[in-house]
């Protein structure tokens, strides 16, 4: 299936040009998306090209500026947030990145009614997190690991917690491991729907071992960065959840929410919090051995001013074949009765589907079914449930949006997006206004991305929000590679792959092959999305064939494929890449003397193991920021898939699955190892150990480190990295410079 045919015709050939590396590094062919910042059923805010904050009313067609670019510029604001009572806007400036989601910033409050900044009782700086209440204009913020509350922006703050301490106690914000591997947010506090209560997590990292690495900077002596970071089997953070009444915060103070007994009996995690009403909250907990999850619904007891979580409102989710959930345990979406909910989990056939839970999980009513997976529940209204899945035409790498009418019996299902722009758009997400009165669809490909606005009742398209016309015009004279998404059937396993082919691809010729791999549990690389990136350039200009393969352990194709890697990381992921390469060779257009593999992070681990597989298939390969031993990686992630590195659990496979154990096998390949020295995620330690093992085995290899760079290798390092990798591959494939 050719998704993006090259537009090359003989008459045009002389005006068309190939992609250059410079195009990629400059972001020449990047695309834009449009996500409305909804403020009601029919209104949204958007930051215009000239940086005014504009309010759009869909029904009147009117738009007007509520905050001028001059005001934004006066404090160098890069972000904003309107209070729900529409009286104030916070302006965010001095953005300073911390980890993947977290950052600190300076906040200013602007009064829209009088066009002035609020003076008196200004916010301290820098703030770790700040948010408005869902109603009115109360403010909750985290400063120096403690939570503060303001009833109004100009009021003095009320301090909720006092025990916050850097790297020790975190209130309202996650520690490193919870941020990266559990919550995937910069915050750990949640307002109740009408702002009566504020729930928050406290993380105690006192006993967690610390990772320390040098940050070289410009000073005479390097700084040492210390992060409490639990590696596999190490002591984990201790979490507690509290709720405080924000109307009378001093009255009884924060009340702790009890942990279910079956969870509290051993090490556990808190995984998410969902408010149902102002007086009902739902907490999700997970055993450290992550195959048992408990969803606990708790109610406010007015008489005792406490939170009660009856055992009858505990719902257990257990996996017998792997870990609980997909990458994370899914979160519930409550219905209007405030007790029943919709949730995605595995059905009896091992496919993740939407279920409706009224009383017990055992009596759950399955809402979707089939040999495909429901991926996300976007919104539940009185009469409709909107979700995404990869059902359409049996392509796991697509995403379409569906509506199920839950107000009628039997419920009817409609695909909202399947036939909208069928060639251009096969991978969607959506953003809904209040009560799903309107919604935006954002299509990511395979064609040029487009964002559109729709009526929530009729699904009618109202207008195009962003269609990337400039990008479309810019690409008119570019020889883009062809892309195919197909599948291989091997030993009862389906291996989906994406192949990126040079513009003038000729099946009768031989081409060098580059495998790009990620391959981590519950990931997906073969997706019907648009991208003009480094591998597009390698195909367009350098004439390489690039392939991405989703093997065992990858997502959205059922539990059999997903959980195949349980407790055995580093085996089947590698096998499946190798199997695919052999199949590609059989297709007849691959030069089997010029095959390479590369990957980043988990992909760096897989590419390293593939190179060291002893198959003789690969001439060369690159590992960027690879994991080299699962004993070096974070507990929450690693133990989910591998269990514990103890003798009575899975220590043997922890030891067997290291890159270092295969050092000898790198002798007959060209290996380029790359890592940032300030990688807080996959520590430089991983590559240091690979390098040491290769040196000890007297195996030659190439390496590049990036001083003071983290796992993303951003900024100027990106340019250097891709230039360096390009040279390496061109040398490997004997391509002239």
């Amino acid at each position: 299936i050719v998704l993006r045919p090259s537009r090359v015709h003989n008459s045009e050939e002389n005006t068309m040009r190939a992609l250059t590396l410079k195009d990629i590094l400059n972001g020449t062919f990047s695309y834009k998306t449009f996500f409305p910042n909804w403020i009601s059923g029919q209104e949204y805010l958007h930051q215009s090209a000239d940086n005014n904050i504009v309010l759009y009313n869909i029904e009147t067609g009117q738009s007007y500026t509520i905050l001028s670019n001059r005001t934004m510029k006066s404090v160098n604001a890069s972000n904003y947030g309107l209070s729900p009572d529409r009286q104030f806007v916070y302006l965010e400036s001095d953005y300073s990145k911390l980890w993947r989601y977290s950052y600190t910033a300076t906040y200013y409050i602007y009064d829209l009614s009088n066009g002035e900044f609020v003076r008196g009782n200004e916010l301290p700086r820098p703030i770790q997190y700040l948010c408005w209440s869902p109603v009115g204009s109360k403010l909750a913020y985290v400063y120096q690991n403690n939570i503060y509350l303001k009833q109004r922006p100009g009021d003095p703050p009320f301090q909720i917690t006092f025990n916050g301490r850097e790297n020790k106690i975190f209130n309202g914000i996650p520690d490193w491991v919870y941020e990266e591997e559990m919550l995937a947010t910069k915050y750990a506090l949640w307002w109740s729907p009408n702002g009566k209560f504020l729930a928050y997590a406290e993380f105690n990292d006192t006993d967690i071992p610390v990772i320390a690495y040098s940050y070289y900077g410009d000073e005479q002596y390097p700084r040492t960065i210390n992060i409490p970071y639990p590696k596999a089997g190490a002591k984990n953070p201790v979490v507690r959840i509290f709720i405080i009444d924000t109307t009378y915060p001093a009255y009884v103070g924060p009340q702790e929410v009890p942990v279910p007994a079956m969870i509290a009996s051993s090490d556990y995690y808190f995984s998410w919090l969902t408010w149902v009403t102002d007086e009902r909250v739902c907490l999700q907990w997970l055993k450290r051995v992550q195959n048992v999850s408990v969803l606990s619904i708790c109610d406010f007891r007015e008489d005792w001013q406490t939170w009660d979580c009856p055992k009858t409102q505990e719902h257990i989710e257990e996996s017998r074949t792997g870990w609980a959930g997909g990458f994370f345990v899914s979160t519930p979406v409550f219905s209007y009765d405030a007790i029943s909910y919709y949730k995605i989990f595995s059905d009896k056939d091992g496919y993740k589907h939407i279920h409706y839970i009224k009383d017990t999980v055992e009596n759950a009513i399955q809402i979707t079914s089939g040999k495909w997976e429901a991926i996300n529940i976007f919104r539940v209204t009185q009469d409709s449930l909107f979700y995404s899945s990869n059902e359409f035409e049996e392509y796991p790498g697509r995403r379409n949006i569906y509506r199920i009418s839950i107000g009628s019996y039997p419920p009817s299902k409609k695909c909202v997006t399947c036939h909208l722009r069928k060639e251009r758009c096969q991978y969607y997400t959506a953003s809904f206004s209040d009560y799903a009165k309107y919604y935006a669809l954002v299509c990511y490909g395979p064609g040029i991305p487009i964002s559109t606005l729709h009526d929530g009742r009729t699904d009618q398209e109202i207008k195009i929000l962003e269609e990337n016309k400039e990008l479309e015009n810019a690409l008119k004279n570019i020889q883009l590679p062809k892309e195919e998404i197909k599948k291989l059937e091997v030993d009862e396993i389906t291996l989906w792959y994406k192949m990126i082919l040079p513009p003038q691809f000729d099946r009768s010729k031989k081409y060098p092959l580059l495998i790009q791999v990620y391959g981590g549990p519950c990931s997906q690389s073969v997706r019907s999305v648009f991208a003009v990136n480094w591998i597009s350039y390698l195909a367009s200009k350098e004439g390489m064939v690039i392939a991405l393969v989703d093997g065992r352990g990858t997502a959205f194709q059922g539990d059999k494929l997903l959980y195949a890697v349980y407790r055995k990381l580093g085996v089947y992921e590698v096998e499946d890449q190798i199997t695919a390469v052999r199949k590609f060779i059989e297709m007849g257009f691959i030069d089997e003397k010029r095959i390479a593999i590369w990957g980043w992070s988990y992909g760096g681990y897989v590419s390293s193991l593939a190179l060291a597989s002893g198959t003789g298939l690969f001439k060369c390969g690159i590992a960027v920021a690879p994991v080299s031993s699962w004993e070096y990686y974070a507990s929450v992630y690693t133990e989910r898939f591998m269990g514990l590195p103890t003798k009575d659990d899975n220590l043997e496979h922890y030891k067997n699955s290291t890159v270092m154990a295969r050092a000898e096998y790198f002798r007959n390949v060209d290996y380029l190892l790359i890592h940032g020295t300030a990688d807080d995620n996959v520590h430089f330690q991983n590559s240091a150990q690979i390098a040491k093992a290769l040196v000890n085995a007297q195996v030659d290899f190439q390496a590049m480190w990036y001083s003071d760079q983290n796992h993303g290798l951003s900024g100027l390092s990106t340019n250097h990295l891709y230039t360096h990798m390009t040279h390496f591959l061109k040398q490997c494939f004997s391509l002239s410079d």
Partner: nanobody
């Protein structure tokens, strides 16, 4: 361009009532979020009450329980019913979008004076 015209102000005794009106020219008034604002002498302008397109209303703490914002979609008119008036309610009252439009989009307003 939408035009806003306030009326209904006047002099009233403390404890008395007034009803302010704001005529709005422009289509589909019903879905516009509209607000009443006021500015007392020597003070900054402040929001008194706001009403969204979904008829959800919001009030300043100082007027809660005394003032009521409403709209008549047929007449394209916004109202503010003010009861139990206090001397501190003395101000020029303006209507505008909610949140207000940036810049000089404020009308003449209507003066409300509450005598003790």
């Amino acid at each position: 361009q939408v035009q806003l015209q306030e009326s209904g102000g006047g002099l009233v005794q403390a404890g008395g009532s007034l009803r302010l009106s704001c005529a709005v020219s422009g289509r589909l008034f019903s879905t516009n979020a509209m607000g009443w604002y006021r500015q007392a002498p020597g003070k900054q302008r402040e929001l008194v009450a706001g009403i969204t397109g979904g008829d959800r209303s919001n009030y300043a703490d100082s007027v809660k329980g005394r003032f009521t914002i409403s709209r008549d979609n047929g007449k394209n008119t916004l109202y503010l019913q003010m009861n139990s008036l206090k001397p501190e309610d003395t101000a020029v009252y303006y209507c505008n979008f909610y949140p207000p439009i940036v810049g000089d989009y404020w009308g003449q307003g209507t003066q409300v004076t509450v005598s003790s």
